[in-house]
């Protein structure tokens, strides 16, 4: 009689994580009398999946009565795949022996491979705040996919972004791997609504990208401009000087009038106005009483906006006219006014 | 060579069920997603939404959320579109579609589509 | 939701002349625009992918373009299986709505 052959007809199996694997082993031949068990690797470190004379196999099912006197199918299934059950896989004939059974006939192995999918990218930006001009990293990370190979690109408000550098690690042969990226992008003052978009495409995906986002309102600071104008004459000595703040984001903003240097007033913004692309406007307005004073005075308007160092525009009030003249002349008065930093 | 052929046609009464399937022949089943496309008797075309074969998430558009399901068997390369609790709106021709994508795994259209099945909802 | 709009809804012309389909996305789809043609009784067919990528097999008389919002699917000398109804889908993120359709008819 022929001898014994141990079958294995597929030389690899696909299987989804999550999925259960059907492992196929036939035997051509019920002689020698003897169990079966299955072996992933090859070798004196090969691992035991499934004996099918003794131990506890929660995960493995055989496909036939192994208990029938005349089978023949050795095929098992074992459930619930992941990304670490990749490999190739033994199907082991045994001869009965005393004490232990011997080894007799293995088949030619079957590879198991697992397609995981990646996990929802994240994306993060910088810890600190930036400014419209500046260049910020965006960093993108997904993990545990298999295979290899994937494709990852970046866009900024959906246009495409080529200015990045992407690893998958690790290098050689792994059960799962992992994407990083890290992208460039030019901050510019309309960024306030502006997204990063990470997107990540694989086999397991089937076409439909996933997706990450960072929202550029938690990456960009944009610092106010300012504007000090004098009013119309409210009453005979009174003048309204107003400070426009214009343009910025975040809303976080103290402003502080001084009047020859000397602190007048501080207050927070708080009833600002949106502009469309975001950035936010405010006014703050100071009422001087110009009989108060026998010399001209400076006025400036002091802004820190969250947390950076205090702008400020300064505007001369000439005392020594007539204040309803002073009123009439604004334009003139303004030409001396001058922007600084405060340290 | 690539195809989809989809059950016959379905004669069914309100408040019925009805199971239409899908079976893909020609290429690996679990490498693509299914799609089904609804067309009604005025001729548009509706997507319903997609199945992924490997992962078995099932996208469906806002209108065909509830009563309509996707499966798959994918031992038998089938992919199947159930609609509960029948209407008379459901009368239509079904379509399965294979959901095609490129060298860099981004989806583009549909290559290849079933012959429809036509289900009509009559007391 | 993106809603795509065909225009004309019908098209009468005879084999040989040039014809041409526009679709409109009611936001930037950049291009992610597909085109299918369905003959009566029969299957859809892509045509054309990626706004103007032609599919596999379809004759070079048709051509797509656009991107953004504004497409059109162009056809040089049309022959008589050229008839039939046109569709445009979009794919830029769920759902991936079509257009109304365009019937093309033999004048």
């Known amino acids: 009689e022929e001898e014994l052959q141990v079958i294995q007809p597929d030389k690899s199996v696909l299987v989804a994580a999550g999925e259960t694997a059907t492992l196929r082993c036939t035997a051509t031949s019920l002689i020698p009398v003897g169990p079966i068990q299955w072996f992933r690797g090859a070798g004196p470190g090969r691992e035991l999946i499934y004996n099918q004379k003794e131990g506890h196999f929660p995960r493995v099912t055989t496909v036939s009565d192994l208990t029938k006197r005349n089978n023949m199918d050795f095929s098992i299934r074992i459930g619930n795949i992941t990304p670490a059950d990749a490999g190739t896989y033994y199907c082991v004939k045994f001869r009965k022996g005393s004490p232990d059974d011997v080894e007799f006939k293995s088949g030619a192995g079957t590879e198991l491979s697992v397609r995981a999918k990646p996990s929802a990218p994240v994306v993060s930006g910088p810890a600190a705040r930036a400014t419209p001009q500046h260049t910020v990293s965006f960093t993108c990370e997904s993990h545990g996919f298999s295979p290899r190979d994937i494709t990852l690109k970046w866009f900024k408000n959906g246009n495409e972004l080529s200015d990045f550098q992407t690893n998958v690690d690790p290098v050689g042969e792994s059960v799962s791997y992992s994407i990083h990226s890290t992208a460039k992008v030019v901050l510019t003052r309309e960024d306030v609504h502006s997204q990063v978009i990470c997107e990540v495409a694989h086999v397991t995906l089937q076409g439909d990208p996933l997706r990450g986002t960072a929202n550029l309102s938690e990456t960009i600071r944009v610092p106010p401009t300012l504007e000090v104008t004098q009013q119309p004459v409210r009453a005979e000595n009174q003048v309204n000087v107003t400070c426009q703040v214009r343009k910025f984001y975040p809303q976080r903003l103290q402003l502080t009038w001084l009047e020859n240097g000397n602190v007048s007033r501080t207050e927070t913004a708080s009833t600002v106005t949106e502009n469309k692309d975001g950035t936010y406007n405010w006014m703050s307005w100071l009422l001087v009483n110009v009989s108060a004073h026998r010399d001209d005075v400076k006025l400036t308007c002091q802004v820190e906006h969250d947390g950076q160092p205090a702008v400020s525009k300064s505007h001369d009030l000439k005392v020594s006219a007539h204040p309803k003249e002073q009123g009439s002349n604004t334009a003139a008065e303004n030409t001396g006014s001058n922007e600084r930093n405060i340290y | 060579q690539i195809q989809l052929v989809q059950s016959g046609p379905e004669l069914k009464k309100p408040g019925e069920t009805v199971k239409i399937s899908c079976k893909a022949s020609?290429?690996?089943?679990?490498?693509?997603?299914v799609n089904w496309v609804k067309q009604g008797p005025g001729k548009d075309l509706q997507w319903m939404g997609w199945v992924n074969t490997n992962t078995r998430e099932s996208t469906y558009v806002e209108d065909f959320k509830g009563r309509f399901a996707f499966s798959l068997e994918t031992s038998a390369s089938t992919a199947y579109l159930q609609i509960n609790n029948l209407k008379n709106e459901d009368s239509s021709t079904y379509f399965c579609a294979r959901g095609a994508y490129d060298a860099y795994y981004y989806y583009y259209g549909m290559d290849y589509w079933g012959q429809g099945t036509s289900v009509t909802v009559s007391s | 939701d993106i809603q795509m709009t065909q225009s004309p809804a019908s098209l009468s012309a005879s084999v040989g002349e040039t014809v041409t389909i526009t679709c409109r996305a009611s936001?930037?789809?950049?291009?992610?625009l597909t085109w299918y043609k369905q003959k009566q009784g029969k299957s859809p067919q892509l045509l054309v992918y990626n706004a103007k990528t032609l599919a596999e097999g379809v004759p070079s008389r048709f051509s797509g373009s656009g991107s953004g919002t504004q497409f059109s699917l162009k056809i040089n000398s049309l022959q008589p299986e050229d008839f039939g109804s046109y569709y445009c889908q979009h794919h830029y993120g769920s759902p991936r709505t079509f257009g109304g359709g365009t019937k093309l008819e033999i004048k």
């Open positions: 936001e930037n789809i950049y291009s992610y």
């Open positions: 020609g290429y690996t089943f679990t490498d693509y997603g």
